[in-house]
């Protein structure tokens, strides 16, 4: 029961996390114009991994994609790569974990196989989460560096006559979405790894051994410690706890759909 709950919860948390990583990657507000000195601005700039946008006070918004690949900063390329790797690993992890779920039966898949798949997906979720957190953190560090550099050069002028205000950028909503999503994916991965330990058979298969006590004809057949089906025949050397009876928590549950704003 606890194992299934842990595995199911790990899956759902990871699913939410990966959806968040995808959302963060697609969002345009990775960096937003700093409004500290001017809270009411006529032109508001914000930038994402794929395009930069300008929202005018007239309500008009214009976005331009970064059509160059070689002209982009190496750090931005690195962040893109980390986020994409995170999404790919997370997506594969989700696919693997669906088949690993204890509440879903696929043919005669053994628990050892499900345990391995749960561990694999858990590791994938952990790496995916770390990639997202790393990507967002690298971008945040880049912003902090640029922020203080632009603060130092806030006003440049021709003999002090003409002022050119340099636009400063601060953390955008996507960074917070990315950090939270990465954290959720990481937590989900850890939960899957914990669930894997509970799924893994702790004892190898035992051959049925008959003990004949004098005067009695009772056969003791030690089975798996998780047996709940009683002393059934185990002639084919199957693990007893892999039997057909299913507990309440093993009823098939369908993951609910989540809306992301």
């Amino acid at each position: 029961m606890a194992v299934t709950a842990c595995q199911g919860l790990g899956f759902v948390v990871s699913l939410i996390g990966i959806a968040g990583i995808i959302a963060a990657t697609c969002m345009d507000q990775w960096s937003t114009q700093d409004l500290y000195n001017n809270p009411v601005t006529a032109v508001f700039n914000y930038q994402g991994l794929w395009r930069s946008c300008v929202r005018e006070s007239s309500g008009f918004t214009e976005c331009r994609g970064y059509f160059t690949l070689l002209g982009l900063p190496a750090m931005l390329q690195a962040v893109r790569a980390l986020m994409i790797v995170g999404i790919v690993l997370g997506a594969i992890g989700l696919l693997v974990s669906i088949f690993a779920l204890k509440c879903i039966r696929i043919g005669s898949m053994e628990d050892s196989a499900k345990a391995n798949m749960t561990l694999t997906s858990g590791i994938m979720f952990i790496v995916s989460g770390l990639c997202a957190i790393a990507g967002v953190s690298v971008f945040a560090n880049m912003l902090v560096t640029n922020f203080w550099m632009s603060t130092a050069n806030m006003y440049t002028g021709m003999g002090g006559m003409v002022q050119t205000v340099q636009t400063r950028y601060t953390f955008g909503a996507a960074l917070f979405v990315g950090w939270v999503a990465g954290g959720l994916t990481l937590i989900g991965g850890v939960m899957m790894c914990i669930a894997c330990r509970g799924l893994a058979p702790e004892e190898t298969n035992y051959k049925a051994v008959s003990y004949h006590a004098s005067g009695h004809s009772v056969a003791y057949k030690p089975g798996g410690f998780k047996a709940s089906t009683g002393f059934g025949s185990n002639t084919k050397n199957k693990k007893i706890y892999d039997g057909g009876a299913r507990t309440e928590d093993e009823v098939q549950s369908y993951p609910s759909k989540h809306d992301y704003v």
Partner: antibody, heavy 118, light 113 residues
Framework: QIQLVQSGPELRKPGETVKISCKAS????????MGWVKQAPGKGLEWMAW????????TYAADFKGRFAFSLETSASTAYLLINNLKNEDTATYFC???????????WGQGTSVTVSS | DIVETQSPSSLTVTVGERVTLSCKSS????????????LTWSQQKPGQPPKLLIY???TRESGVPNRFTGGGSGTYFTLTISSVQVEDLAVYYC?????????FGTGTKLEIK
């Protein structure tokens, strides 16, 4: 076609109040901001305010804070300019204009002449 | 506030002549986010409301004759009328649309000989 029709000329005494209306037609009123511009007789244009017609939030020029109130009636696609405690220097033609890309103003009302005289 | 200084204050030209009006801003109107200059040119004929000619310093508004051309960047801008027509008799205003308040220039009055 797109039109901004303003209310007729007004004659007021100092200390009185005047309310100018600007009715928009031919477009979705809340999709564009509304600007107000003042032009004193024989003078240049003076930007007064910029109103977000969706939220109703105005952005004023410093000279037009206090006695000037900018409001909207979105159901009637109308913007209003209220001037309290009129002064002689408020004598001018007031224009409303639709804000578009580049924060520019493409369609203008015909203007409302306000004369403040004792 | 940003201050726009227009020159000359008035100009008398003959029909067909090429004329350039200038507008100098006290602060750069170039937005780094989209590399656009937030400056507008408007034309006001006597007894009429202003009419938008140019926005983003060089983008001509639809319906505006192509003899009107906007140029410049940063703090210095120009409006060029390649061949002045009688109907171009008006006052021309440049306006900052980059930062509140959206101040107008003092205007250049174009007169025909």
């Amino acid at each position: 076609q797109i039109q901004l029709v303003q209310s007729g000329p007004e004659l007021r005494k100092p200390g009185e109040t005047v309310k100018i209306s600007c009715k928009a037609s031919g477009y979705t009123f809340t999709a564009y901001t509304m600007g107000w511009v003042k032009q004193a007789p024989g003078k240049g244009l003076e930007w007064m305010a910029w109103i977000n017609t969706y939220s109703g939030v105005p952005t004023y020029a410093a000279d037009f804070k206090g006695r000037f109130a900018f409001s909207l009636e979105t159901s009637a696609s109308t913007a209003y300019l209220l001037i309290n405690n009129l002064k002689n220097e408020d004598t001018a033609t007031y224009f409303c204009a639709r804000g578009v890309r580049g924060n520019s103003m493409d369609y203008w009302g015909q203007g409302t002449s306000v004369t403040v005289s004792s | 506030d940003i201050v726009e200084t227009q020159s000359p204050s008035s100009l008398t030209v003959t029909v067909g002549e090429r004329v350039t009006l200038s507008c100098k801003s006290s602060q750069s109107l170039l937005n780094s986010g989209n590399q656009r200059n937030y400056l507008t040119w408007s034309q006001q004929k006597p007894g009429q409301p202003p009419k938008l000619l140019i926005y983003w310093a060089s983008t001509r508004e639809s319906g505006v004759p192509n003899r009107f051309t906007g140029g410049g960047s940063g703090t210095y801008f120009t409006l060029t009328i390649s061949s002045v027509q009688v109907e171009d008799l008006a006052v021309y205003y440049c306006q900052n649309t980059y930062s509140f308040p959206f101040t107008f220039g003092t205007g250049t009055k174009l007169e025909i000989k």
